[in-house]
């Protein structure tokens, strides 16, 4: 276990007995929870890799950046950060890698300044639909969240509830229309097979959307039309076979967009012709010369940009692994 930081450092660690003696009272201005490091100057508290099983009750009121990574929190109950006086300054909260499997309704209530939340690398088998909105009203008070990081929150298959993981996550994103101000959403590495069609339309402020390293096969029913502020769309490392005309037109219509499409198993047959034509003309795709055919075998490793219509014929035979993707 690490020892308290020296007094020369801007971080301080209180002795455990001090923390326990006052944990039921409002925190003292310079108090630091046991097993944490605090810097009032940086408005930062770090309780990292300490196997904490609950959120410390005696967090200092000045905290603006709170790191609770690498712990064993398991459950985040309603009002997990509700304090008296409230943590009115808390703007960035990182809970990644803390073995959370349940986040309950209202877990982040009473955090009026919370702009960045990172729940990555937690096996979230049970994410309440009202985790971010705090209430089950059809229209909730707007959340202050601007950045929501949910990379690799998919639980192991044997721990999943008997429902769609995609559906569970989307329900939490859309509940009460609380996240209308969200600008960055990261959903990488979650084994998503599809993107529910209504999700993007209800997040109109998005600037950055990361869906990389999922298992998305198609974007046919996904609409990007309303995302007029979208600046980056990460779709690398999925199972995309082709992008169809509707999707291509919508992406081209977004004024600030950069799209990342590397490492998808593009199928270079007759259905690819529109995408190839678009790639040759568009400036929105980053690193477009790196996009290569994966199937059929005779087209493998061919660069999409260099194909012409004569190359793109339709042969119904696909390898078994692709038919089942």
């Amino acid at each position: 276990s690490s020892s308290p930081t020296s007094s020369a450092s801007s971080f301080s660690s209180s002795a455990p007995f001090l923390a326990s003696a006052v944990s039921a009272q409002p925190p003292l201005p310079d108090q630091c929870p046991a097993l944490c490091e605090c810097s009032e100057a940086a408005r930062t508290v770090k309780c990292v890799n300490r196997n904490l099983t609950e959120v410390p009750t005696d967090l200092p009121a000045y905290v603006r950046n709170l790191f609770l990574t690498g712990n064993q929190l398991a459950v985040l109950p309603a009002g997990a950060f509700a304090r008296r006086p409230p943590l009115a300054e808390l703007a960035a909260l990182n809970l990644s890698g803390s073995r959370l499997d349940e986040v309950r309704a209202g877990a982040f209530e009473h955090l009026p300044s919370l702009r960045q939340l990172d729940l990555s690398h937690n096996p979230l088998a049970d994410l309440s639909p009202f985790a971010f909105s705090g209430s089950n009203a059809s229209v909730s008070a707007p959340s202050p969240l601007v950045e929501l990081i949910l990379n690799h929150i998919v639980p192991p298959e044997d721990e999943r509830q008997n429902r769609s993981f995609e559906g569970m996550v989307v329900a939490a994103l859309l509940a009460g229309r609380a996240l209308q101000g969200l600008r960055r959403l990261e959903l990488a590495s979650n084994h998503f097979l599809y993107l529910p069609r209504d999700v993007l339309a209800q997040l109109p402020s998005l600037r950055h959307l990361d869906l990389s390293n999922n298992s998305l096969v198609s974007l046919t029913y996904v609409s990007f039309r309303n995302l007029t502020h979208l600046e980056s769309l990460h779709l690398e490392d999925n199972a995309l076979k082709v992008l169809h005309n509707g999707t291509l037109a919508e992406l081209q219509g977004l004024p600030h967009i950069r799209v990342f499409l590397d490492n998808n198993p593009w199928v270079c047959d007759c259905h690819m012709a529109d995408m190839v034509t678009w790639l040759k003309e568009t400036e929105v795709v980053q690193g477009k010369d790196r996009l290569t055919c994966a199937y059929p075998e005779k087209m493998r490793n061919r660069v999409l940009l260099e194909l012409n219509s004569a190359d793109l014929d339709c042969d119904p035979i696909l390898p078994p692994s692709l038919q089942t993707s």
Partner: antibody, heavy 116, light 107 residues
Framework: QVQLQQSGAELMKPGASLKLSCKAT????????IEWVKQRPGHGLEWIGE????????NYNERFKGKAIFTADTSSNTAYMQLSSLTTEDSAIYYC?????????WGQGTTITVSS | SIVMTQTPKFLPVSAGDRVTMTCKAS??????VAWYQQKPGQSPKVLIY???NRYTGVPDRFTGSGSGTDFTFTISSVQVEDLAVYFC?????????FGAGTKLELK
């Protein structure tokens, strides 16, 4: 059928530079990336980098930046790799291959020996 | 860089044996793995792509499987002409990296 024909073996002095060639036939040269791979006994296969001949786009393994430079001549369907400031560590077989995902066709290799 | 740890280094075999070698990636690479055969004095030849797909013309005694970090390459009944070094390669992220190889040799 696809073929990659590489230049012959070379014996070089330390500090010298040389240019290896890889002539492609049997496919559209500009339409696929050419990869370069180094093989030394006891060191296995090591990716040096790649070039897309039609666009002269290149990507290098960090370890070989400053050591290797790729070029391509689309009129002769030939890719080149220049190696500079040779040392004994550069003694190896160098392969060109067609790829980007797996490397589906390989040249026969060029053996380079660096010795004073 | 992603490290591909290939085991075993040497595999003593007799004709007709079923043999298996494995490759473990230092992080998930999806199914972006190929297997190559290299005979003495020759360049490598790709046998398997996307972890489990055999290239046309590759005998069906060669099979690959796995995803994520653990991959397996099997020869169901070794022939004398299969004596060679076999390499795995990941192409999930740059730089592409290879395993150190498994050498098949006669018992």
């Amino acid at each position: 059928q696809v073929q990659l024909q590489q230049s012959g073996a070379e014996l070089m002095k330390p500090g010298a530079s040389l240019k290896l060639s890889c002539k492609a036939t049997g496919y559209t040269f500009t339409g696929s990336w050419i990869e370069w791979v180094k093989q030394r006994p006891g060191h296995g296969l090591e990716w040096i980098g790649e070039i897309l001949p039609g666009r002269s786009s290149t990507n290098y393994n960090e370890r070989f930046k400053g050591k290797a430079i790729f070029t391509a001549d689309t009129s002769s369907n030939t890719a080149y790799m220049q190696l500079s400031s040779l040392t004994t560590e550069d003694s190896a077989i160098y392969y060109c291959a067609r790829g980007r995902r797996d490397f589906d066709y390989w040249g026969q290799g060029t053996t380079i020996t660096v010795s004073s | 860089s992603i490290v591909m740890t290939q085991t075993p280094k040497f595999l003593p075999v007799s004709a007709g044996d079923r043999v298996t070698m494995t490759c473990k990636a230092s992080q998930s690479v999806g199914n972006n793995v190929a297997w190559y055969q290299q005979k003495p004095g020759q360049s490598p030849k790709v046998l398997i792509y996307d972890a489990s797909n055999r290239y046309t013309g590759v005998p069906d005694r060669f099979t690959g499987s796995g995803s994520g970090t653990d991959f397996t390459f099997t020869i169901s009944s070794v022939q004398v002409e299969d004596l060679a070094v076999y390499f795995c390669q990941q192409y999930y992220s740059s730089p592409p990296t290879f395993g150190a190889g498994t050498k098949l040799e006669l018992k």
